[in-house]
Every structure is written in C-alpha cells, then in structure tokens.
Interface confidence: low
C-alpha cells in the first residue's frame, strides 16, 4: 500500500481467483483513543472499533472511503483504491491501446517545435467517475522539472456503438534548451482513477523524436507565363522554432489528381517555393519536416490547381 | 577552416558536408518505426558519448558571441564518432559491406573534422571509452546505439553550420 495523495491510498493486488489479497491497517488521524468506530462509504454498518482498523483487501468491494467517527462526529477519512496485477502485468483497463506506433501505446505525445513544450493525449471509452493526474520530468534518476497542466477532455468520437473520449495535456520543460542535443529523455507519468480502480501509464521520449511541425502556411500559386507550370510558394508555420536559419525545415511538394489512383508527382526542396506542372482538377500540397532529423512530417497544406 | 586564434571556418562547406552527414546517418540506420514507449535496454554504453549541451555556445546567440566554443565541441564530437566508426565495433564481425553508408559516414566525419581543424593545430579531444566488446552481437547493439546518438549529434552540428553560413559568413 502507498499514498497517492493526502488520505488516498493505493493497494496493489495480485488479481487471480482465490487470491489472498493484502492486509491493510488503517489508523484514524486523531488524538482521541477511545470510542472510535469505522464505516465504509455511505453504509452505517460498523466495521470495527478502536484507533486502528485491520482489513483484508481482496476485491473492489473492500475498497472505498473508510471513515472513523466518534459520537457522530467524523474524525478522518482514508480512500482505498485498487491497482490490479494479473499474470505479473499491471492492468490497463482504463485507457485504450492506440496501437500506433506499436502495440501497448496508451499515451501519444507530439511537439510542434524545440521549445520544450509538448502535448500528450490518450483515449478511453469511460465517460464518468474518471480522473487523471499528469507528472513529467527530464530524466528519472536526477529529474529536471517539466510542468504539466490539467488533463482535459479534448474530443469525443463515435466508434461504431461506442463513444470514445480523447483527453490531452500540455507540458512545458522548465529550463528548455532548444539548441542542445538531448541526452536524457522526457518521462511522462499519468495516474488514472476510475471509480475505485487505479492505473498508471508512462511514456518516455526525446523531444526530437516527437517533433511534428504544423503545416506550411500561406500556400500560394503563381502561374508562369506561356506555360502549364506554376510557382508554388509557402512560409514556415508560425509555431516553428526560430531563427529559421538555425531551425530549418525541408519540404515535400505533391501534385495529386482528383482520383486517388492517379500518379502523384513529388518534389523535395529546402526552399520555400517550387515550380511544378499544374494539371486540370489537380491539387497541390506541401508538408514540412525537420531538415536535419527524421522526425514526423507535418500534415499537408493544400490548394486547388484551378 | 578554423584557424588557431579563432578565425571563421568555411561555413558554407561545413554546411554542405554536415547536411550530407545527416543524410548518411539516417541511411546507415533508418527509422524502423518511431517508438514512444521505452522498454528494456541497458543504456550504460552510450552515456559516455559527447553531447552538445546547453552551455556549449551552439545556440544562435552563442554562435554570434563566440563560435569557437561551439566549433571546438563539434570538432571533439566528430573525432569521437570518427574513431568509433573506425573501431572494431564497426570493422569487426559481423562485417559491413565496404561501400555501406557507414563507410561513407566515417569518411565524411573525417572530412568535416579536417575542415574545422587544419593540420598542426590541435584542440583537445575527448578520450574514447573502451567500448568494444569481443562478441559480434554486442557490437551490433553498439552500432545501433552509436548511430542513434550520432543522428542527434549531427543534426545539431548541421543547424550550427546552416546558421553560420546564413549569418556569420564573411
């Protein structure tokens, strides 16, 4: 058993049929010694008396808010949550496996630049009685500070018969150094509580590996005289790190016909313009990637040829 | 070339070669699918590699103030990785093809380090830890780790030279 926060405790249980469970001793936070009784949740049934209460925690029915009283007055509370371990593996019932980029990916994180700011998100099908708490640091043995906001519900989707809820959190490294080469990874820890079930999820990454620039902005076409060619121009996204002479992007320009089956023409360039042939009913798209490190490409920015 | 006393390197040449290094580092060990989640892995072996850290003056402001600190750090790293790629970690079994990207990477590291430091002038270089294991498969693991670290190192070096070529070239 360990303390998650004041008056909230997590009991770690090996979860299998007829498991013995864990013996837990609760102590009433009071100077009083006599006349103390204990109850669980809203029940008025007295579970025991005395300053301490010893219970055998085996299942969710044994978890909940234990309260000690004296003469009708509440003295203190202890909320017990359960963390299940089945076949040596901690349960992951609360969050959905996103399976990208690999199985058992519950948290996904992205950064738009090297400022030390990043966003993580996760999915669940649970709609109520759900709380999340997020902590982060750079490195684990001698951790350096990363500040995370509160996790918020950022999207709802219908997937077949189920509703899926996306939560996200923004974090910022306290003393970010955008130009340095990272040697210690960022660690992100999410505590999830659903009713009386506790679970924790972690992710570890270098910012450079989760970089995904925003799409290029101000994508424009300028027809060239007496030619089917057009000059495509664009600008770095506002959210990208500056100066651009240092934090450079490379770009991919694609000409795509109306039909997905039509051959795509692609040009790669470090410049912010390119000359391409604009076919009728085609569209021109541009995306960006860090010029010197192969992290993710941005989403496409597109304009129609016409 | 960086001349003793601190005159400027050939920024544009360094920019071109460092960008080539980035390309080669990724072709030597391409992205097999980016992993967010950390799993098992003994990490002691590449913690000794030189990193370009916050106080090394490799940020745009530091380069403007005095690029020599940063260039010295980059030079140290280039020599370090050049020695690693020339060591039996990469030359021993299991053997790589002579024209593999690793061989080209090795030559380019040497080329860039020579651009930064002419003969006869010696910056202090970092001692290479005795990493080389006798077993071929352990060499294989080290290759993975070294190339991943090198990709991060040359990315920062390439940014430095790109910025220098754009803003500090005479």
């Amino acid at each position: 058993i360990w303390e998650l926060k004041k008056d909230v405790y997590v009991v770690e249980l090996d979860w299998y049929p007829d498991a013995p469970g864990e013996m837990v001793v609760l102590t009433c936070d009071t100077p009083e010694e006599d006349g103390i009784t204990w109850t669980l949740d809203q029940s008025s049934e007295v579970l025991g008396s005395g300053k301490t209460l010893t219970i055998q925690v085996k299942e969710f029915g044994d978890a909940g808010q234990y309260t000690c009283h004296k003469g009708g007055e509440v003295l203190s509370h202890s909320l017990l949550l359960l963390h299940k371990k089945e076949d040596g593996i901690w349960s992951t019932d609360i969050l959905k496996d996103q399976k990208e980029p690999k199985n058992k990916t519950f948290l996904r994180c992205e950064a738009k630049n090297y400022s030390g700011r990043f966003t993580c998100w996760w999915l669940t099908t649970i709609s109520t009685d759900l709380t999340f708490s997020v902590k982060s640091s750079r490195g684990s043995s001698d951790p350096q500070g990363v500040t995370c906001g509160a996790a918020t519900l950022s999207a709802e989707r219908v997937r077949g018969d189920n509703k899926e809820y996306e939560y996200s959190v923004e974090c910022q490294e306290d003393s970010a150094c955008p130009a340095a080469e990272e040697s210690l990874p960022i660690e992100v820890m999410v505590d999830a509580v659903h009713k009386l079930k506790y679970e924790n999820y972690t992710s570890s990454f270098f910012i450079r590996d989760i970089i995904k620039p925003d799409p290029p902005k101000n994508l424009q076409l300028k027809p060239l005289k007496n030619s089917r060619q057009v000059e495509v121009s664009w600008e770095y996204p506002d959210t990208w790190s500056t100066p651009h002479s240092y934090f450079s992007l490379t770009f991919c320009v694609q000409v795509q016909g109306k039909s997905k089956r039509e051959k795509k023409d692609r040009v790669f360039t470090d410049k912010t313009s390119a000359t391409v042939i604009c076919r009728k009913n085609a569209s021109i798209s541009v995306r960006a990637q860090d010029r010197y490190y192969s992290s993710s490409w941005s989403e496409w920015a597109s304009v129609p040829c016409s | 070339r960086a001349v003793p006393g601190g005159s400027s390197p050939a920024w544009t040449q360094c920019q071109q070669l460092s960008q080539k290094l980035c390309t080669l580092a990724w072709s030597a060990h391409p992205l097999v699918g980016h992993m967010d989640l950390r799993e098992e892995g003994d990490e002691e072996t590449t913690n000794d590699v030189p990193h370009i850290q916050c106080g090394d003056g490799c940020d745009p402001q530091g380069l403007r103030d005095n690029s020599q600190f940063c260039l010295q750090r980059i030079h140290q790293g280039l020599i370090f990785y050049e020695k690693l790629l020339g060591s039996d970690i990469f030359t021993g079994e299991p053997s790589l093809l002579p024209d593999s990207p690793v061989a080209q990477l090795h030559a380019s590291l040497l080329g860039l380090s020579q651009l930064l430091q002419p003969e006869g002038h010696h910056w202090e270089t970092q001692q290479i830890p005795s990493l080389s294991p006798s077993q071929p498969w352990q060499r294989l693991l080290l290759r993975f780790k070294i190339l991943r670290s090198l990709q991060a190192f040359v990315a920062v070096a390439a940014r430095v030279f790109a910025h220098g070529a754009a803003t500090l070239s005479p």
Epitope: P185 | V32, G33, M35, G41, E93, L96, P136, W137, F144
Partner: antibody, heavy 126, light 108 residues
Framework: QVELVQSGAEVKKPGSSVKVSCKAS????????ISWVRQAPGQGLEWMGI???????WYAQKFQGRVTITADESTSTAYMELSSLRSEDTAVYYC????????????????????WGQGTLVTVSS | DIVLTQSPATLSLSPGERATLSCRAS???????LAWYQQKPGQAPRLLIY???RRATGVPARFSGSGSGTDFTLTISSLEPEDFATYYC?????????FGQGTKVEIK
C-alpha cells in the same frame, strides 16, 4: 498478433540440402531479428545463426559453411538452408524472433527469443 | 563456448510445492544476458525470464529469476498443473548463444 509460420516437415537423403521457410503473419516483420534454433529428438536447444540489421548474417561456428540464412522483406519470410546433411542433423528446426530492447526510444535485438515458429521436423535418412 | 549446466536434470514435485532450478555457467555471464524458457512436449519454447530476473509479457508472478556471474536460479513459488514441463536457461553474452541441457519438472 504476429505469428511465425514455418514450412512443413521434410525427409532428406544424407548429403542433400534442406531449405526451411518462416513467414511472419499478422503484423510487421523484421527479418533483421530472426534466429534459427534446432532441437534433436529428446535433446536440448542449439542456436544456429541470425539475420541481423547493421551486420548482415552470422552463424554459430559449428554450422559455418553449411548454413545460409536469408530473408525476403517483400514476402515477410525468412529462410534457413542447411547443406551436406547428415543423420545427426535430424531435428526440429525453429525460427525465433529476438525480443526487442530500447535505447533512447529506438529498438535493437536482445537475442532472447520471445516469439517462435511451430517448428519444422527435418529427417535425414538414407 | 560458454557451457551452461542445469541441475537437477529432473525435479519431481507436487502441485503447490516450490521449485528451484539452477543454471551454472562455465564463465561469467552478465545478468543482462541470461534468459529462461519453458518447453512442453510437442511445443516450441516460451520465453519466461530475461535479464536474469525480468518476467516476459504475460508470465505469472509465481515465476521469478535471480543470480549473477556464473550462478542463476529460476524459482516457481507454487507449482500449478500447467507448470510441469522442461526448463532451459540460455546465455546471450557470447556467441554462440548456448542453452543448458534442461531441467524436467515432473509430477511426483
């Protein structure tokens, strides 16, 4: 879920060769980490060799010159060919995938085998 | 080559009993490079423990590994009927990767 599916049992004459295949189905395939292990009837396990990224292929000294391990990424299939067969090569041959470890977010093989094919019995008899 | 010697060759126990299997190496093996497998007749081996003490995915908590240098142990705290099988240790410190000759855990 990834599965390694091996080719069927073979009966071979002494002096001939056998080629066993191992196809990955239901997930991404990395031939870079496929090892071959054999087990003679009633005996223990014996590692033969591996196909490894950043280092081609290498073999246990005992099989050097007789075994060839290859892979075809396009069909997600690894192959093990053993030549100059003798009666003591009668065994079940397994392909096995190395468990992957991580370094700073990148995978590499640990050479401990977390996924195995069902095995292919090769009988060498005149 | 590193030779791994497992003992005992056979272990006769009843369900619920504790099983202790030993694996001794002819030269020192980094604990990062020792694994244990379980094999049942007619089946492929299954990875139980790697890094000498870390349980592989889905392996029950009753299995645990320990040891370093040349002496390693696999412990099954309370035998279940499905645990009766042959167990192999494997080192991946040096090539060729070698396996022990196996310990058969049978029902008494």
């Amino acid at each position: 879920q990834v599965e390694l599916v091996q080719s069927g049992a073979e009966v071979k004459k002494p002096g001939s060769s056998v080629k066993v295949s191992c196809k990955a189905s239901g997930g991404t395939f990395s031939s870079n980490y496929i090892s071959w292990v054999r087990q003679a009837p009633g005996q223990g396990l014996e590692w033969m060799g591996i196909n490894a990224h950043l280092g081609g292929t290498w073999y246990a000294q005992k099989f050097q010159g007789r075994v060839t391990i290859t892979a075809d990424e396009s069909t997600s299939t690894a192959y093990m060919e053993l030549s100059s067969l003798r009666s003591e090569d009668t065994a079940v041959y397994y392909c096995a995938r190395s468990k992957k470890g991580m370094y700073g977010g990148w995978t590499y093989p640990l050479m401990m085998f977390d996924l195995w094919g069902q095995g292919t019995l090769v009988t060498v008899s005149s | 080559d590193i030779v791994l010697t497992q003992s005992p060759a056979t272990l006769s126990l009843s369900p619920g009993e504790r099983a202790t299997l030993s694996c001794r190496a002819s030269q020192s093996v980094s604990s990062n490079y020792l694994a244990w497998y379980q094999q049942k007749p007619g089946q492929a081996p299954r990875l139980l423990i790697y890094y000498a003490s870390r349980r592989a995915t889905g392996v029950p908590a009753r299995f645990s590994g320990s040891g370093s240098g040349t002496d390693f142990t696999l412990t099954i705290s309370s035998l279940e009927p499905e645990d009766f099988a042959t167990y192999y240790c494997q080192q991946t410190s040096n090539t060729p990767f070698t396996f022990g000759q196996g310990t058969k855990v049978e029902i008494k």
